[in-house]
């Protein structure tokens, strides 16, 4: 499909001249950021961004690639080097430590320097590093964590926890030896390490004693509480704050977000991770966009400002399953949340960053025609005389041999939300990829986001922009961060 | 491998504070660019950049990812949307039209708007679009094209040619019907469309009549001249300029580049594409770095400045072969050329851009240990109990079934320069990928390179920065572009 207007050079020349005009008008703000928002697309490498752009565009009856994601509108871009201290290709724990605490750690550890060793409890103490969220709280800001995964998952945990094992969600996941050495599960740290004003996502089961039925799935005890210490962490958290509210469904969330008596809000909408957007029961579970809006309504009451972490956490899960449909629809919802946040905040006082913790071995090739489905087939046949999809994975569970050969695929099969794209190597879970990811920035001090940087730079930019430790002498005026 | 110094949070905090300091010091230059250099890594997507960084670092006995490519040091980064008007995933012809002429075209066409149709000669006339190089020449600058492919290849041809078929290298490749309609081969256009001061790369055979033996391979007639029109285009080109020199080997190139009587230089060092860097005979063929240096020596004599196109064109070829070793060693040589150019020019008056025309379905995953070979195996085994490499392709010629199964691989096999990484889908040639590519910028007006842009924006930034058409009223002072 060739759009007629695009045949004319004037179309492109005018468009580029407008883009140049916009570029020339860009003026770095010299003010501090009152508010900080970091949007984290878990596993959202550049190939995911592009494919999601095309899909989002096509959902609006456009050809696709010429459209804009909300993140595409952010004026500043950098590339972020995601390796962990011990691995070329990192996990979401070590990377969370980097972009939330400003220090690189080791694979599968969270909130700890690289002096800590995976799974070795006795290497925890003394190696804790402090997140920007924690520093923002100390500076009097309100803080929040919003995610589509469990709130105890690696990425959000980087904002509040310190653990040598990212899988220690509840005490049932922590070996007795580690518990005896004083290592706490992540759910316990969520309510005890610091005061978080808004906590929204999944992860109910880690908060309640084993045998506590889940309110949404009371007959499924694999979804019920998992704790072995008998603690009801939600009850403990509620007891800490007079204006605290706990909600577990969408209706309660929307009510609580509009209730001026609510000062602290915990919403846990699934026992584990929240459902994929395509599977979400919109009567029971809020979308990431709705959670983001609820968080902003509460946090923005604080005249000193806020810090908010928003994660599209299941982009990653879709890719691990080699189900690009899931990964890309999650990315679109993530982008919708970015768009909504943009409508509810001002770039005059809010530094917004969008980035990924790492990428995936996900590619988009095969010379498809413009306007063709992102989930469709490449033109022509492969060397084995079979069709192939434009989306493919380097490794993952999509590898199948049928009668000793690669299976054929039809357009209707490849368009299914359940379809697993093929891969070169068969793995139970497709792996992360190690290439640089993009950082998109808008708002005060966004111009500092430039070039190729270590992933740690992200945390430092946020801290500097809001004059938080160790940049309290930031020399940014007016100090929009302290307007009370 | 965990470097001891990286275990200390101070290491990361200091490093990030320095990076912040550098970011704060960045001052957009308000001057025009006297000189323009565009470095084009053909097929150099972000995954290629990262993998090449690690390889280059390891060649210097470092662990890899913590090191810097020359392009990493460029202060400004943007993302470029590479789709062509008719395809989600483009080729090097349509993309060259975009970044060199500022207008998007159709797949496999060059220097033509999208009103032109692939292979339809009669859609050429009236749809030509003019490159920034051509405009620079008209403004009195010297201009040059340097590539490791044949100089008539799609990417360099975007600087000077207009053709509905990128494969029309010599008249022997153009159907008689098209020739009768007046469509010229690319080699003819190279010497006749505009005055190019420096032309360095491969592509000898397209310049000479069929039956002309090649000077380097006189006994191999498949390497000799291909032209059917009896023309010796080199002779014709030499006749146009009093100070013109033609060279075909490294020794002659180095001599010519230092000869003040040489005003125009054409160096064609192979009959077709130049050899991969790993196969190059360094006594006969210059490296891309050496060609870049030679070009800069000649072009920088012009007080009005210059435009230079430098292409690492065989990065793409390595990927098409699914031979990552070739692609990455080509990328390193490309980066070495960028580094050398940086030493020979000043960012006070030279806008340098580094970008790719498109990416490849090339991925780097599998959680390898830091410091392990980029060509090595992932830790653990795949689901089929066989080893697998960290580098893989979505599609390509690396797909092999051995006794109805995926072949096993050893570290020594995967480290071979000839090894083809496995792919999900068997193709004769691995395909391009459609995700956004990076644009790195340094020098006057480099700050305009920001955010997510159409690929066409690159040409417009160059034109604006040097006050070329259509931006002659650029309002940039001092007009460093006209210092004579």
């Amino acid at each position: 499909i060739i759009p007629v207007e695009e045949e004319n050079p004037d179309f492109w020349n005018r468009q580029a001249a407008e883009a140049l005009g916009a570029a020339k008008k860009l003026q770095p703000a010299q003010t501090a950021a009152k508010n900080l928002i970091i949007f984290l697309g878990d596993g959202m490498g550049v190939s995911t961004v592009t494919a999601a752009r095309i899909l989002k565009g096509q959902k609006k009856d456009k050809l696709g690639p010429e459209t804009f994601l909300a993140m595409d509108r952010f004026p500043y871009v950098a590339l972020s080097k995601t390796y962990s201290v011990d691995k070329h290709v990192p996990d979401s724990g070590a990377t969370a430590t980097a972009y939330l605490c400003g220090v690189k750690g080791n694979f599968q550890t969270i909130g700890l320097s690289a002096a800590a060793r995976f799974n070795q409890c006795n290497t925890t103490r003394g190696n804790e590093v402090i997140s920007v969220m924690n520093r923002a709280k100390k500076a009097g800001k309100s803080v929040g964590v919003v995610t589509t995964t469990r709130v105890q998952h690696a990425s959000p945990a980087g904002a509040y926890a310190h653990t040598v094992n990212r899988n220690w969600y509840s005490d049932a996941d922590v070996p007795a030896s580690a518990r005896q050495e004083g290592c706490q599960d992540i759910a316990t740290q969520l309510i005890s390490n610091m005061d978080i004003d808004v906590i929204l996502g999944g992860g109910r089961k880690y908060m309640f004693p084993m045998g506590t039925p889940d309110p949404e799935y009371p007959d499924d005890y694999s979804q019920g509480g998992t704790r072995l210490d008998g603690k009801n962490l939600v009850q403990e958290w509620l007891a800490k704050h007079q204006g605290a509210r706990y909600v577990w469904n969408r209706t309660e969330l929307l009510q609580a977000s509009l209730d001026p008596s609510v000062t602290h809000l915990m919403g846990l909408f699934e026992p584990g991770d929240m459902k994929y957007e395509i599977h979400r029961d919109s009567t029971l579970d809020p979308s990431l966009m709705e959670m983001t809006e609820a968080a902003l309504l509460l946090l923005s009451r604080n005249p000193r400002g806020f810090f908010l972490f928003v994660e599209g956490g299941r982009i990653d899960h879709g890719h691990h399953e080699s189900r690009a449909y899931r990964a890309l629809t999650e990315t679109i919802m993530f982008d919708d949340a970015i768009e909504r946040a943009g409508q509810l905040t001002s770039e005059e006082d809010t530094l917004s960053l969008v980035t990924a913790d790492h990428s995936h071995v996900f590619s988009f090739g095969g010379y498809p025609l413009r306007g063709s489905s992102i989930f469709g087939l490449a033109p022509g046949k492969a060397r084995d005389r079979k069709a192939y999809t434009v989306l493919l994975y380097g490794n993952g569970p999509g590898y199948v041999l049928k009668d000793g050969a690669r299976p054929d695929v039809t357009e209707s099969e490849s368009g299914s939300p359940e379809y697993r794209q093929q891969s070169a190597v068969p793995l139970d879970g497709e792996t992360h990829a190690g290439e640089d990811v993009a950082v998109f920035a808008r708002g005060p001090q966004a111009h500092l986001v430039h070039g190729v940087q270590e992933q740690t730079f992200i945390a430092h930019v946020m801290a500097f922009a809001a004059c938080l430790e160790p940049y309290t002498a930031c020399d940014l005026a007016p100090r929009a961060g302290t307007t009370d | 491998i965990i470097p001891v110094e990286e275990e200390n949070p101070d290491f990361w905090n200091r490093q990030a504070a320095e990076a912040l300091g550098a970011a704060k010091k960045l001052q957009p230059a308000q001057t025009a660019a006297k000189n323009l250099i565009i470095f084009l890594g053909d097929g150099m997507g972000v995954s290629t950049v990262t993998a090449a960084r690690i390889l280059k670092g390891q060649k210097k006995d470092k662990l890899g990812p913590e090191t810097f490519l020359a392009m990493d040091r460029f202060p400004y980064v943007a993302l470029s949307k590479t789709y062509s008007v008719d395809k989600h995933v483009p080729d090097s012809g349509a993309t060259a039209t975009a970044y060199l002429c500022g207008v998007k075209g159709n797949f496999q066409t060059i220097g033509l708007s999208a009103a032109a149709r692939f292979n339809q000669c009669n859609t050429t006339r009236g749809n030509e679009v003019i490159s920034v190089m051509n405009r620079a020449k008209k403004a009195g600058k010297s201009v040059g094209v340097v590539t490791t492919t044949r100089v008539q290849h799609a990417s360099p041809a975007g600087a000077y040619a207009h053709t509905v078929n990128r494969n029309w290298y010599s008249d022997a490749d153009v159907p008689a019907s098209a020739r009768q309609e007046g469509c010229q081969d690319i080699a003819t256009q190279l010497i006749s469309n505009m005055d190019i001061d420096v032309i360095l790369g491969g592509g000898r055979k397209y310049m000479f009549p069929m039956g002309t033996p090649d000077p380097e391979y006189p006994d191999d007639y498949s390497q000799g001249g291909t032209r059917l029109d009896g023309k010796n285009l080199v002779q014709e080109w030499l006749a146009k300029h009093q100070g013109a020199r033609y060279v075909w080997n490294r020794t002659e190139l180095l001599q010519a580049s230092l000869d003040p009587s040489v005003t125009h230089l054409m160096g064609l060092f192979e009959p077709g594409d130049m050899k991969y860097e790993i196969h190059r005979d360094s006594t006969l063929d210059p490296s891309l770095m050496e060609m870049t240096e030679a070009a800069l020596l000649l072009l920088s004599r012009n007080p009005r400045g210059f435009f230079l196109f430098v292409e690492g064109g065989r990065i793409d070829h390595g990927h098409h072969e699914s031979r990552a070793y070739r692609a990455l060693t080509e990328t390193i040589m490309f980066d070495d050329a960028i580094e050398r150019a940086g030493q020979l020019t000043s960012e006070e008056d030279t806008l340098s851009l580094v970008t790719a025309d498109h990416s490849h379905v090339f991925s780097f995953g599998g959680y390898p240990l830091r410091g392990s070979s980029i060509f090595g195996l992932a830790p653990g085994k795949a689901r089929d109990r066989k080893a697998y490499t960290v580098l893989l392709y979505g599609n390509g010629p690396g797909y092999v079934l051995k006794d109805g199964a995926r072949p096993d691989v050893t570290e020594s096999e995967s480290g071979s320069p000839e090894y083809r990484q496995q792919s999900a889908v068997p193709l004769d040639g691995e395909t391009h990928a459609g995700e956004d590519v990076a644009v790195f910028a340094r020098g006057p007006q480099a700050h305009l390179v920001h955010g997510v842009q159409e690929q066409t924006f690159i040409a417009h930034v160059m034109a604006f920065a040097a006050c070329l058409e259509p931006y002659t009223a650029c309002d940039l002072a001092p007009r460093a572009g006209t210092t004579d």
Epitope: W168, G211, G224 | -
Partner: antibody, heavy 120, light 111 residues
């Protein structure tokens, strides 16, 4: 069909050691399962020995069993019970059992049992 | 934790209702970690009820569990011949040592 089977039961001398193996078929243990061992002396009631929680390989034992009995996960489908310093009082049918997913105190899948006889 | 079952044996006619009691020496974990098992001679135990009142899949609704904390009851209504077996309660105190224990068992004879 999901099944458990114990193996390794034998006639041994007092003071000897013995390792019993519990093998799953039709499923593999996930992190929400507790794998437990119990025993039943001839004509007597059931006695709990201990469990292993698959999520973190934590083990929990009855007071009387601690030190002499060790439960280990050896693969995603096998669990072992190592017993040392056996006495006649340890003569029993030994059962392995899998918990309801997420509920460590309820065992809904049992093996048929294997007989251990300690006698000189 | 010590689980005490009463009675140790019970004889009931077909169609009657029978109640078996189980007392824990201290509160079970979360006040609900109590399970009931049925064992027939020469067979492995079979789970009937867990978390004090939840019927395991495939168990007839004639079986009912109740109670909380330290006092629990198993009620079998409309007893049938096939219900003849020994019934055990099992309590879980937590991840402390000696975390679980079975009761002594109640033998049910159906007349």
């Amino acid at each position: 069909q999901q099944q458990l089977e114990e193996s390794g039961g034998d006639l041994v001398q007092p003071g000897a050691s013995l390792t019993l193996t519990c093998t799953a078929s039709g499923f593999s243990f996930n992190s929400n399962y507790w794998m437990c061992w119990g025993r039943q002396a001839p004509g007597k009631g059931l006695e709990w020995i201990g469990c292993i929680l698959f999520g973190n390989t934590d083990t929990y034992y009855a007071n009387w069993a601690k030190g002499r009995f060790t439960i280990s996960k050896t693969s995603s489908t096998t669990v072992t019970l190592q017993m040392t310093s056996l006495t006649a009082a340890d003569t029993a049918t030994y059962f392995c059992a899998r918990s309801v997913s997420g509920v460590g105190s309820a065992w809904n899948l049992w093996g048929p049992g294997t007989l251990v006889t300690v006698s000189s | 934790i010590v689980m005490t079952q009463t009675p140790s044996s019970k004889s009931v006619p077909v169609g009657d209702t029978v109640t078996i009691n189980c007392q824990a020496s201290e509160s079970v974990y979360n006040n609900n970690h109590l399970a009931w098992y049925q064992q027939k001679p020469g067979q492995s135990p079979k789970l009937l009820i867990y978390l004090a009142s939840i019927l395991d899949s495939g168990v007839p609704s004639r079986f009912k569990g109740s109670g909380s904390g330290t006092q629990f009851t198993l009620t079998i209504s409309d007893v049938v011949c096939d219900d003849a077996a020994t019934y055990y309660c099992a309590g879980y105190k937590g991840i402390t040592i000696d975390g679980s224990a079975f009761g002594g068992g109640t033998e049910l004879v159906v007349k």
